[in-house]
């Protein structure tokens, strides 16, 4: 849940190139206005995942997950949490 | 934001070597299954892509990485 | 117009040491990961090292590992190969060869060699 | 380390006829095969890269194809200027070369 709030675009993109769905990555990718080559480009690494099927999909999800939970990307995410705060509080 | 370890991660999967991506995922997930998968991905992301489709997948991270729903 | 270079090679005795450079020209050096390869006389190619475009990953074939350091410096457009400890059999023409953006393809340009004679 | 095994080591072929060069690799490497021709004195120089792709300003006589462990190098009608060694590399895991296959005109 947490990674998905750091940048929730980059984490739809992703997970529909991964998951395969050609539909869900059109939509995911229009909400960034790109372009043609652009999303031929995204459909070349979803046909990597397609061709190497669910296992393959999986643990990339897995990989993709362990490290958005890491404490590379956790540390980071309490600190901005933390920074956040305190502009808050000097705002008021 | 999108976190450094996530960028790094991605960067790596489309501008680096098969040797350098595995390497990066073993830092945090270190089976054996998980790195020859990484490895396959790799290799095959870098037989399907150019030049300009790695440069038009960079183009979109950062579209990405500079949205506001980001 | 993609230029390689190589320079540095000589005779040296067995324990010896030598440096290689590669000069590269025509293209935008440090966008691209370069390569060591070599070849003894009358045998085929043998990949020896190869570095990343930024200079913080290194490769090496197990033949060399723990003698040879490949390194560069953008700045100059130039890559190195630093020999240590040689033998009879480091004995090969060198070569450096850049390999496609983005690791698009292994050695798509290679330099001329030079060649490197380990010998008392 | 992945051991590259190319076959035969030397063939002998009369210009126009079809050459076919192989390339065995040790364990699955995809389709991260690149073919190299070596003229005498000269420095290799890439033919095809990815199994099946044609580098640019190669001649369309010279195609590769395969995927996982066997690759195939295949040059349609041979001229005297094909002369030369031929080598396989596999990027799948760090690089190796194929011991070379040594293409002479009859």
């Known amino acids: 849940v947490k990674m998905a709030e750091t940048c929730p675009i980059f984490y739809d993109v992703f997970f529909a190139v991964a998951n395969g769905n050609e539909l869900l990555l059109d939509l995911s990718l229009t909400k960034v206005n790109a372009t043609e080559p652009e999303r031929t480009a995204m459909k070349k690494i979803q046909d990597c995942y397609v061709e190497n099927g669910l296992i393959s999909r999986v643990l990339d999800g897995l990989v993709m997950t362990t490290i958005s939970s890491s404490k590379d990307c956790m540390g980071e995410a309490v600190q901005n949490t933390v920074e956040d705060l305190k502009l808050n509080t000097l705002g008021r | 934001e999108i976190c450094p370890a996530v960028k790094r991660d991605v960067d790596l999967f489309l501008t680096g070597t098969p040797d350098e991506y595995v390497e990066q995922v073993a830092q945090y997930k270190a089976l054996p299954v998980v790195l020859e998968n990484a490895r396959i991905l790799k290799n095959c992301v870098d037989a399907k892509m150019t030049e300009e489709d790695k440069e038009n997948a960079l183009s979109l991270l950062d579209k990405i990485y500079t949205s506001p729903l980001c | 117009e993609v230029q390689l270079v190589e320079s540095g090679g000589g005779l040296v005795k067995p324990g010896g040491s030598l440096r290689l450079s590669c000069a590269a020209s025509g293209f935008t050096f440090s966008d691209y990961y370069m390569n060591w390869i070599r070849q003894a006389p009358g045998k085929g190619l043998e990949w020896i090292s190869y570095i990343s475009s930024s200079d913080d990953t290194t490769y090496y074939a197990d033949s060399v590992k723990g003698r040879f350091t490949i390194s560069r410096d953008n700045a100059k457009n130039s890559l190195y190969l630093q020999m240590n400890s040689l033998r009879a059999e480091d004995t090969a023409v060198y070569y450096c060869?850049?390999?496609?953006?983005?690791?698009?393809?292994?050695?798509?340009?290679w330099g001329q060699g030079t060649l490197v004679t380990v010998s008392s | 380390e992945i051991v590259m095994t190319q076959s035969p080591d030397f063939q002998s072929v009369a210009p126009k006829e079809k050459v076919t060069i192989t390339c065995r690799a040790s364990?699955?490497?995809?389709?991260?095969l690149h073919w190299y021709q070596q003229k005498p004195d000269q420095s290799p120089k890439l033919l095809i890269k990815y199994a099946s792709q044609s580098f640019s300003g190669v001649p369309s006589r010279f195609s590769g194809s395969g995927s996982g462990t066997d690759f195939t190098l295949t040059i349609n009608s041979l001229e005297a200027e094909d002369a030369a060694t031929y080598y396989c590399l596999q990027s799948y895991t760090l690089r190796t070369f194929g011991q070379g296959t040594k293409v002479e005109i009859k």
């Open positions: 364990q699955n490497i995809g389709s991260s």
């Open positions: 060869a850049r390999d496609g953006k983005y690791n698009t393809v292994a050695g798509d340009h």
